[in-house]
Interface confidence: medium
């Protein structure tokens, strides 16, 4: 599949800069506004908190000989899970959660939540058309993933209002391609 455009649907996130002696004092403030994910905590440096990044993808479907007449629009779920303020009971990690530790056995991943099935027409080089039935992603969500699970099996635990893991490394999650089948 060819991605012609990808639009990020979340507001820009800037991480605080570690305080070093030579750094600029204004730029170097670790900001707490909007970091605590409470409904009234967005007073300073306000930004929208998102559960995970929903990237809007516009792409053409091709099976080798035939290509879709019009581009397909769908969401691609990507990035780290930053909790939504509206997640029930989520108020950040407590000391007792031990989620800070690198050795935490759980991670939160941004995965497909809602999908819909639609038919799409492909125009072939010989002038004929083919109809495919494809599944496109319409929403993303954070799911808790235990590390002993095989990543490829997508054996995720169900969503709960527990406290998310604090991530110590960037995780790249490859988005699933749209599933398609001949019909």
């Amino acid at each position: 599949f060819k991605n012609d455009a990808t639009e990020i649907l979340y507001s820009h996130v800037v991480k605080p800069v570690p305080a070093h002696p030579s750094s600029n004092s204004t730029l170097n403030q670790a900001r707490n506004g909007g970091r605590h994910f409470s409904n009234t905590g967005l007073d300073r440096n306000t930004r929208v908190q998102v559960g995970c990044r929903e990237l809007r993808s516009t792409k053409y479907i091709s099976d080798g000989q035939c290509t879709s007449i019009s581009p397909l629009k769908e969401l691609v779920c990507a990035g780290e899970c930053l909790p939504l303020p509206v997640l029930p009971n989520w108020i950040g990690g407590g000391y007792g959660t031990k989620y800070w530790s690198r050795r935490s056995s759980q991670e939160w991943r941004c995965v497909n939540d809602k999908t819909r099935t639609q038919r799409i027409q492909l125009q072939c080089q010989d002038g004929s058309t083919r109809t495919y039935k494809i599944t496109v992603v319409t929403a993303c969500k954070c799911k808790r993933y235990t590390r002993q699970h095989n990543e490829s099996s997508h054996n995720f635990e169900s969503m709960s209002p527990a406290k998310p893991v604090q991530h110590h490394r960037e995780r790249k999650r490859a988005s699933k391609s749209s599933k398609h089948s001949m019909s």
Partner: antibody, heavy 123, light 107 residues
Framework: EVQLQQSGPELVKPGASVKISCKAS????????MNWVKQSPEKSLEWIGE????????TYNQKFKAKATLTVDKSSSTAYMQLKSLTSEDSAVYYC????????????????WGQGTSVTVSS | DIVMTQSHKFMSTSVGDRVSITCKAS??????VAWYQQKPGQSPKLLIY???YRYTGVPARFTGSGSGTDFTFTISSVQAEDLAVYYC?????????FGGGTKLEIK
Amino acid sequence: EVQLQQSGPELVKPGASVKISCKASGYSFTGYYMNWVKQSPEKSLEWIGEINPTTGGTTYNQKFKAKATLTVDKSSSTAYMQLKSLTSEDSAVYYCARLHYDYDGVGYAMDYWGQGTSVTVSS
Amino acid sequence: DIVMTQSHKFMSTSVGDRVSITCKASQDVSTAVAWYQQKPGQSPKLLIYSASYRYTGVPARFTGSGSGTDFTFTISSVQAEDLAVYYCQQHYSTPPTFGGGTKLEIK
């Protein structure tokens, strides 16, 4: 403005109990863990425990598990700590402190503290 | 429990001087360390968290560094109002623990 207003000083007899309050204002009370810290000249600062005001879930320092009980009243945005079977070793200043959780900076720390409640245990 | 050791109970300095306070953890705590300032008769105040992140509104003269077991809190140019006790605290494991404090005295 975020404020944590603690109850006044307490003078109690050995063996008695005391309940300290910490009224939060200026922020969403259920949006942050509340921690409790003991400060005494002998032991400096000691973490007693924390409570999730949304669920009432608590985590205690093992040392204080039999000594302290943490509760909250969401309707009044107030956190409480009850100390029981008091002895002279419990004489100290007790603080409530809101837990700062920075997801991007991967850090915890206590960003707002109450003014402290002095507890004196004496016969 | 992890023990946080601040080797100097007292440190004497002059206005304008650079001063560094050290803190040693009994085991690796990564960068899970915060620094607090407590002025006489006041509650502790958060200055640095995650070893090097300056908290909101904290002047740029206050910095933190270190990882693993050794941590340093530095005031690049001491002001008269910096007279206080400074505490380090680890939050790598429960219970979080504090150092014994270093009292900064101004000559």
